[in-house]
């Protein structure tokens, strides 16, 4: 695979990561070099504490901070360095589980891989040029910091600490692949890969924003749908000290403090679910694009891949409208999502609707980004549900979903697909955090009439639920499209926050496939036991935990 140069062997004989590891990156006064030391140093450029509780709770926890007395570029690079340093074993195992053979030595689609490599190289080169031409731009400053953080992560993992001044290169098939996992779903189609990661109709997350009666609270919940091989999870807390621009005169950015659900070696969420110090909670579910005519908009120049635009918007925005304005610039048409931006600063507990700003919805497809304030809708219906189907009619139509409704029926419709109906039926049962966890983990496919698939044999289908369990579909069944097949895929977590929890940068989180109404997932007893799942527990029976930041 494309594991950065020295490959997986470097100092990884012991793959059992320590329960806790604390490291700092120092700027050595005498040599001028960055260096790693154990513990938290008062004058460190960056420091991180990784607590590995994967076997106990299904999560590892990363607490990472940087020091504002150093310039942003140094902070960003050092943040990457220290993250890789404390989580190198987890990074190795996650890479092996998910990416090791992607465009690797045994890849038979060499043509696609060459196209992908070329696309990424041109795109990275274009961004470097833009960064040079727009050195005073807050946007391009944040893009540069994001890429520097990735560079630090990769350098550190490879056992090299060389802070880049001026231009720097990112390997297109190195740890960039871990960042672009979402973008790849669309790049594969845009670049004509024959066997794509994406199954037709495959869901990629459920989410709900629920206004409790009397507006006594506003709960935000997200359930990631992913391959089970991705279940090495880290909840990350970043406390950065970046400025809006490269000079010291610039003010600090709004989103320096953030907590998010993530993966080893990934410097953003990917789920996506963020609690930001700016008072925003940002989350998405993937809507994809089923219209081949739109792939022409996916070009390596003039676009910034979604993972970077996501990071930049989270850092710079103070409200939903600004977040959308930042995010929609340089639309790549990759990782096409419905984004929900909740602004808790605008929410009045026990109060009336402020009319706007509490909820902003953004939908992206190639060549198009549509944004609307949906605060009034939220207060009228008391919830906003998201389930991988575009809300905006123009996006729904342009992305080719009408054809799929014509071909397969209501499963692809916005109002009548199984999750839309389950959310509509059950959202009123949410009255607190625990009932919200129950809803976002809900899967009672064997007994719920809304989980039936009329064209399937058997009819009950584990994909047709808020938290899918596609491993439970029979292998020998008959299904109209791939998403309904048996596969090692489903809802792999839950994250829920509230007005008061978000203020404290906290959440309730559970890791692993749902087992509320179903037998728990166990690798050794599953049809997928031979798949790589290094570092993962065998049996997934974890309860929700309150994220334990000190």
């Amino acid at each position: 695979g494309a594991l950065p140069t020295q490959g997986p062997g470097r100092r990884r004989q012991n793959l059992d990561p320590p329960v806790s590891r604390v490291r700092s990156v120092l700027l050595d006064a005498a040599s001028g070099q960055l260096r790693l030391v154990d513990g938290i140093h008062p004058y460190a450029v960056a420091w991180a504490n990784l607590t590995n509780a994967i076997r106990e709770t299904g999560w590892a926890y990363l607490d990472l901070g940087t020091n504002g007395s150093y310039n942003d570029s140094l902070q960003a690079y050092a943040a990457g360095v220290v993250e890789a340093s404390v989580s190198e074993e987890l990074i190795y195992m996650h890479w092996m589980n998910t990416m090791v053979n992607y465009c690797g030595p045994f890849e038979y689609e060499v043509g696609y891989c060459e196209k992908l490599k070329s696309f990424l190289e041109i795109n990275l080169e274009w961004m470097q040029r833009e960064m040079e031409l727009s050195q005073d731009s807050p946007y391009w400053h944040q893009v540069r910091l994001t890429l520097l953080q990735l560079k630090g992560l990769e350098d550190s993992y490879e056992g090299r600490l060389t802070f880049p001044t001026g231009r720097f290169t990112i390997k297109p098939l190195g740890f960039l692949l871990l960042q672009i996992a979402g973008d790849l779903e669309d790049l594969e189609q845009a670049l004509n890969k024959t066997s794509t990661k994406l199954s037709l109709g495959s869901g990629s997350c459920s989410a709900i924003i629920k206004l409790l009666p009397g507006a006594r609270d506003l709960l935000v919940a997200h359930n990631t749908w992913n391959s089970y091989q991705n279940m090495l999870r880290i909840i990350k807390k970043y406390q950065l000290q970046f400025r809006q621009g490269p000079q010291e005169a610039y003010p600090l950015i709004a989103g320096n403090n953030l907590v998010f659900s993530s993966y080893p070696g990934t410097i953003f969420s990917g789920d996506d679910f963020y609690i930001l110090g700016s008072g925003l909670v940002t989350l998405e579910t993937t809507i994809g694009n089923k219209n081949p005519a739109l792939w022409k908009y996916v070009q390596p120049q003039g676009c910034v891949l979604e993972w970077i635009r996501n990071i930049v918007a989270n850092r710079l925005a103070l409200d939903g409208a600004t977040w959308a304005d930042i995010f929609k610039q340089f639309n790549s048409g990759t990782y096409n999502n419905q984004w929900m931006i909740v602004d808790y600063k605008a929410f009045i507990p026990n109060g009336p609707s402020p009319g706007s700003r509490v909820l902003t919805i953004l939908e992206q497809i190639p060549g198009m980004v549509v944004v609307a304030d949906k605060t009034e809708d939220l207060y009228k219906t008391t919830y906003w549900a998201s389930y991988n189907i575009p809300f905006f009619e123009i996006v729904f139509n342009a992305s080719g979903l009408q054809d799929l409704v014509a071909q397969y029926g209501d499963w692809f419709s916005y109002t009548k697909n199984p999750r839309a109906q389950i959310f509509q039926r059950d959202q009123s049962l949410v009255e607190d955090m625990n009932s919200m966890v129950r809803l976002i983990r809900y899967n009672n496919f064997l007994h719920d009439p809304l989980s039936l698939c009329e064209a399937c044999i058997p009819k009950p289908n584990a994909e047709n639920a808020i938290s899918a369990r596609s491993d439970l579909n029979p292998a020998n069944g008959s299904y109209p499209f791939q998403a309904l097949y048996q596969r090692p895929h489903g809802g792999i977590d839950v994250k829920v926050t509230s007005f008061s929890l978000a203020k404290r940068m906290s959440m309730l989180a559970a890791s692993g496939p749902t087992w509320d109404q179903l037998p728990p997932f166990q690798w050794s007893l599953s049809p997928f036991r031979s798949m790589l799942h290094m570092g993962q527990p065998d049996l997934w029976t974890f309860s929700p935990i309150s994220v334990p930041w000190d």
Epitope: A30, S31, R35, L36
Partner: antibody
């Protein structure tokens, strides 16, 4: 538990050579910057040389008084750091300590004595 | 080279006293100063780094202060086991340099 153990000291003729070794354990050696410090009655504690980690290209730094005569090196696979001392002089006599430079020289070995005399 | 001057070679003290060992750098070394304790026949032991931060396990009666060129190691409530030689060291520039030491003795 961090341990540093020096060896290789002894009596050496002026102009002669010797190689000091330091075996380390209890920490991730390849990440560590390692130093040699000597202590002689007349000069007190005197920093001799440093070698940075593999990640920092194993860069070496020397005191002016030993430059060109002493060479610091490391073998990460053995968790050892070495000090090759050539063209030894009487003023090189002293106890040589191997140290790990964490925040500063946070761990020291027990030292090995080098005497340069005819 | 930066010269670290410990002007007092010896200091007399009694158990329970408070004593301050001083060290002066010939140029600005920011807070890149460490203090070490050495007992006869033993190797030096690190007490303080970055001028004022104690290493773990070092009793809180040891306090470091200063920045720039003037640095102090204070031992409050001196114990008999504190009778030793104390060295300051700068690691702001190569070559790293040590003070000549201050020996703490009983009155």
């Amino acid at each position: 538990e961090v341990k540093l153990e020096e060896s290789g000291g002894g009596l050496v003729q002026p102009g002669g050579s010797t190689k000091l070794s330091c075996a380390a354990s209890g920490f991730t050696f390849s990440d560590a910057w390692m130093d040699w410090v000597r202590q002689c009655p007349e000069k007190g504690l005197e920093w001799v040389a440093e070698i940075s980690s593999k990640a920092n290209n194993r860069a070496t730094y020397y005191a002016e008084s030993v430059k060109g005569r002493f060479t610091i090196s490391r073998d990460d696979s053995k968790s050892c750091v070495y000090l090759q001392m050539n063209s030894l002089r009487a003023e090189d006599t002293g106890i040589y300590y191997c140290t790990r430079r964490g925040y500063t020289m946070d761990y020291w070995g027990q030292g090995t004595s080098v005497t340069v005399s005819s | 080279d930066i010269v670290m001057t410990q002007s007092q070679k010896f200091m007399s003290t009694s158990v329970g006293d408070r004593v301050s060992v001083t060290c002066k750098a010939s140029q600005n070394v920011d807070t890149n100063v460490a203090w070490y304790q050495q007992k006869p026949g033993q190797s030096p032991k690190a007490l303080i780094f970055s001028a004022s931060y104690r290493f773990s396990g070092v009793p809180d009666r040891f306090t470091g202060s200063g920045s720039g060129t003037d640095f102090t190691l204070t031992i409050s409530n001196v114990q008999s086991e504190d009778l030793a030689e104390y060295f300051c060291q700068q690691y702001n520039n190569f070559p790293f340099t040590f003070g000549s030491g201050t020996k703490l003795e009983l009155k």
